[in-house]
């Protein structure tokens, strides 16, 4: 008797990361086999979409015409042969950025620094949020999580950098996102370029184990303080 | 595109109240603050408060707390400023604007509300 | 409150000429947390709703023509339209974010000699 069904293999285009209101279509990819395509988002209904092959039967396509908050999550897809169902894909994640106001992200104390000196890299958002992304241009993954340990929302999120390198200059942006769901991000924030000056060609730098603050100094404005826990953000690198 | 579109223009007595809407449209809604903002004719711009849709808080000015009570339908992505005891210079264009960080990227066309007995 | 006090009320400049309106708060508006000043501009023509031209002092909004450039810092602040246009004429206001109640200045009103 022959085995398991291939799992099917699940993409998005143009990306797994959408903009509120652009159009996404989810692909999967079977056998030649396949008489249908079933595709399936964690905590909904399922299945979310059924779908006939497209010639040569080997894959079907989702359309979302304009995403919104509904449509962000993560998804499987599993196609029917004539011996039943197929191993479940490896689950694509459909992010969707532009939920909320963009941060602002700063560099302190300047976006000029010295190779060997330190920098911070200050991500503010205007609603208290609980995980903050750093991401680098042209970096394949997000360069920085910081999640809280507890849930306390903050207004903002810190990314010690020490000591630089010219690995960490750059152009960088920052997103902010709420517990309740990690796949909504808000619109990123205005890039900023961080030079490094007098760099020399050091090792790649390990990052740093500080952790960030939950409310900056008492004139920070319109920025509560004292009114967060000082839980502190849990650093992932990724 | 982002718009905020307001409800029309209001005649009302001393005394009375008005309740001015504005409904968006071209971006997610929940995540936004909405600030209402106020013009007298031919005067200068006063902030009047805000309203977070995702989670109903409000934060009003002074000046006008007591008076001003603003609401919001998620279903419609609509919402709502409601001023009340009008008085002669509650006269103005009353604007609905989205909140970027504590300023205002879009702003809604402007709703007249005259006070006049 | 913050009070924001703009100067001149009204300028006329003749086309092509340069443009300066400024702004000046009643306490500084630099945050210490992250060094940015909480200031934007806005553009309002007759009969239409403001339009955000500049925020955090300096950085230009998405759409604004460069001729348009915020500077300044702390307490006292300036908008400069380069090389003005017959568009331009509006009536221009800063506002302060860096405390509630959010204010803005009285306004100045930008006219063609």
């Known amino acids: 008797q022959a085995g398991p069904l291939p799992k099917p293999t699940l993409w998005a285009e143009p990306g797994s990361v959408i903009s509120w209101g652009n159009s996404v279509t989810i692909w999967c990819q079977g056998t030649l086999e396949a008489r249908e395509y079933r595709l399936d988002k964690e905590e909904s209904p399922a299945p979310w979409d059924r779908q006939n092959p497209l010639e040569p039967k080997n894959k079907a396509r989702f359309s979302i015409p304009s995403m919104t908050e509904d449509y962000a999550g993560r998804y499987r897809c599993y196609y029917r042969s004539p011996v039943g169902w197929s191993q479940p894909s490896d689950p694509l994640e459909l992010v969707m950025t532009g939920a909320y106001s963009k941060p602002t992200l700063s560099a302190l104390p300047s976006p000029l620094v010295t190779s060997g000196k330190s920098v911070t890299l200050l991500c503010q958002s205007r609603s208290p949020m609980d995980t903050f992304l750093l991401i680098k241009e042209r970096a394949a993954h997000p360069l920085l999580h910081l999640r809280s340990e507890h849930g306390a929302q903050q207004h903002q999120a810190e990314f010690p950098m020490s000591p630089v390198t010219s690995v960490h200059g750059g152009t960088y942006r920052c997103f902010s996102s709420h517990g309740f769901s990690h796949y909504l991000l808000s619109h990123p924030s205005d890039p900023l370029e961080l030079i490094v000056s007098g760099s020399l060609e050091d090792p790649r730098p390990s990052p740093t184990r500080s952790v960030s603050t939950a409310a900056g100094p008492e004139d920070q404005p319109l920025m509560p303080t004292g009114s967060v826990p000082h839980s502190g953000l849990r650093r992932h690198w990724e | 595109q982002v718009q905020l579109v307001q409800s029309g223009a209001e005649v009302k007595k001393p005394g009375a109240s008005v309740k001015v809407s504005c409904k968006a449209s071209g971006y997610s809604f929940s995540g936004f603050y909405i600030d209402w903002v106020k013009q007298p004719p031919g005067k200068g711009l006063e902030w009047i408060g805000y309203?977070?849709?995702?989670?109903?808080?409000?934060s009003y000015n002074q000046k006008f707390k007591g008076r001003v009570t603003m609401t919001v339908d998620k279903s419609t992505s609509t919402v709502y400023m409601e001023l009340s005891s009008l008085r002669s210079e509650d006269t103005a264009v009353y604007y609905c604007?989205?909140?970027?960080?504590?300023?205002?990227?879009?702003w809604g066309q402007g709703t007249t509300v005259t006070v006049s007995s | 409150d913050i009070v924001m006090t703009q100067s001149p009320d009204s300028l006329a400049v003749s086309l092509g000429e340069r443009a300066t309106i400024n702004c000046k708060s009643s306490q500084s508006l630099l945050s210490s947390s992250n060094q940015k000043n909480y200031l934007a501009w806005y553009q309002q023509k007759p009969g239409q709703a403001p339009r955000l031209l500049i925020y955090?002092?300096?950085t230009r909004e998405s759409g604004v023509p460069d001729r348009f450039a915020g500077s300044g810092s702390g307490t006292d602040f300036t908008l400069t339209i380069s090389s003005l246009q017959a568009e331009d004429v509006a009536v221009y206001y800063c506002?302060?974010?860096?405390?509630?109640?959010?204010?803005f200045g009285q306004g100045t009103k930008l006219e063609i000699k």
């Open positions: 604007a989205r909140q970027a960080f504590y300023y205002f990227d879009y």
């Open positions: 955090w002092a300096s």
């Open positions: 309203i977070f849709p995702s989670s109903g808080e409000t």
């Open positions: 506002q302060q974010y860096y405390s509630y109640p959010l204010t």
